[in-house]
Amino acid sequence: KFSKQSWGLENEALIVRCPRQGKSSYIVDWYYSQTNKSIPTQERNRVFASGQLLKFLPAEVADSGIYTCIVRSPTFNRTGYANVTIYKKQPDCNVPDYLMYSTVSGSEKNSKIYCPTIDLYNWTAPLEWFKNCQALQGSRYKAHKSFLVIDNVMTDDAGDYTCKFIHNENGANYSVTATRSFTVKDEQGFSLFPVIRAPAHNETKEVEIGENTNLTCSACFGKGAQFLATVQWQLNGNKITDFSEPRIQQEEGQNQSFSNGLACVNTVLRIADVKEEDLLLRYDCLALNLHGLRRHTIRLSRK
């Protein structure tokens, strides 16, 4: 059946997402499978349901078990199962295998370690990071957003990395830790000055007023994993986020790897309900890496 394993430590927050995804507007009911008892939605409860999420604030060993979520659209009900296990805190530094998230590999050029499950929580930077239970200190380690970056990775950087953060719920704080292994691989990659595949420089795209249109900025940065490679759109030289027009939205960059090993990134600019004034804007596709910045400009014209 459609089920997912989740685990946590006693006295820490644990938030579990229903493995059966639905639109945010769909109603989700949660039940404790063993008793078929409904999970309350009131936030005053230690364990409560909040849409697609089931929250243990904090978790107890006795919470372990299978939880059923039923996602209800207007015409379909779909069921998922969350298999939750809450473990006692370990007295020593050792993190057992059953508490480990998936192993990630890094290389000299790409050493990002993402903090597992963090996107489910209401947390604020910075994260605390530990390797084999020792707090990470020194300029080689940079906690950035939800990941850790290690400069000049060496083979002895391999090990178990734990991220620790605080989840805030209605003014109350709860600790969360998550651990994953990091392995170091020797990667024969390279990076180049960005090459923009699309759009062509000074291209003009024909659009219909009132229609939707997409502009794709696609750039390649070399072979193998890239330490820094961003692709974004600008409007008249301004960031999309600074340009307060809700009709114009930029998608997060999608990584692509071609059969020839080229590492490329696509970022789509979505323009809804094209208006006359959109034809007056300059749309810049920007590709940036450690070698520098390349810019291609595209304009819109009426069909």
Epitope: K1, F2, Q21, G22, K23, S73, F76, T79, N214
Partner: antibody, heavy 123, light 107 residues
Framework: EVQLLESGGGLVQPGGSLRLSCAAS????????MIWVRQAPGKGLEWVST????????YYADSVKGRFTISRDNSKNTLYLQMNSLRAEDTAVYYC????????????????WGQGTLVTVSS | EIVLTQSPATLSLSPGERATLSCRAS??????LAWYQQKPGQAPRLLIY???NRATGIPARFSGSGSGTDFTLTISSLEPEDFAVYYC?????????FGQGTKVEIK
């Protein structure tokens, strides 16, 4: 009441092109994934292509990749299938259908289908 | 791609009898499997989703079971309008695939 109505089928020579349309009504078209499925005479069902809702991605069967293009016009509540370089084996009834769940990166069943439009590729 | 194999190709039964149709997947599809009914000259009609849930308006005599690679559609007591072709379909991943169909005909 949900309705899907295909049009644009007909007789076309091998190598030719055809554009199918599917007019949708009775639901908020823009938020749903839409699908083309075909059925050769006397044969089973074959998925052709999916276009995700909210301006999302497109997916194609290997047999039509590079020849067929799925698109939608949410302002007209219409789904399209542009078919180029047609072959005899593309001869089939083409159905448009709706995926009622439509979440990012996942697929579901087809709960409403049109009545189909026949495409015949023959010289 | 995931291949769905339906058996038997044809099932010859009388009204009132029980029909058992099988669908086997070449790899696990969890419970992401549907069953459709198609009558001559008509579009398919959704019967079962998520392996065992009846779609809205589908009579209780239709039931689905199974998970992983082996699935069954059961019609507990055939009505005259149930004689048709039945297809299974997986939707765990693209390409979406259908079985080749099982024809339920009147004996």
């Amino acid at each position: 009441e949900v309705q899907l109505l295909e049009s644009g089928g007909g007789l076309v020579q091998p190598g030719g092109s055809l554009r199918l349309s599917c007019a949708a009504s009775g639901f908020t078209f823009s938020i749903y994934d839409m699908i083309w499925v075909r059925q050769a005479p006397g044969k089973g069902l074959e998925w052709v292509s999916t276009i995700k809702g909210e301006g999302g991605g497109t997916y194609y069967a290997d047999s039509v990749k590079g020849r067929f293009t799925i698109s939608r016009d949410n302002s007209k509540n219409t789904l399209y299938l542009q078919m180029n370089s047609l072959r005899a084996e593309d001869t089939a009834v083409y159905y448009c259908a709706r995926d009622p769940w439509s979440t990012e990166g996942s697929f579901f069943v087809l709960d409403y289908w049109g009545q189909g439009t026949l495409v015949t590729v023959s010289s | 791609e995931i291949v769905l194999t339906q058996s038997p190709a044809t099932l010859s039964l009388s009204p009132g009898e029980r029909a058992t149709l099988s669908c086997r997947a070449s790899q696990s599809v969890d419970d992401d499997l549907a069953w459709y009914q198609q009558k001559p000259g008509q579009a398919p009609r959704l019967l079962i989703y998520d392996a065992s849930n009846r779609a809205t308006g589908i009579p209780a005599r239709f039931s689905g079971s199974g998970s992983g690679t082996d699935f069954t559609l059961t019609i507990s007591s055939l009505e005259p309008e149930d004689f048709a072709v039945y297809y299974c379909q997986q939707y765990i991943t693209a390409p979406l695939t259908f079985g080749q169909g099982t024809k339920v005909e009147i004996k």
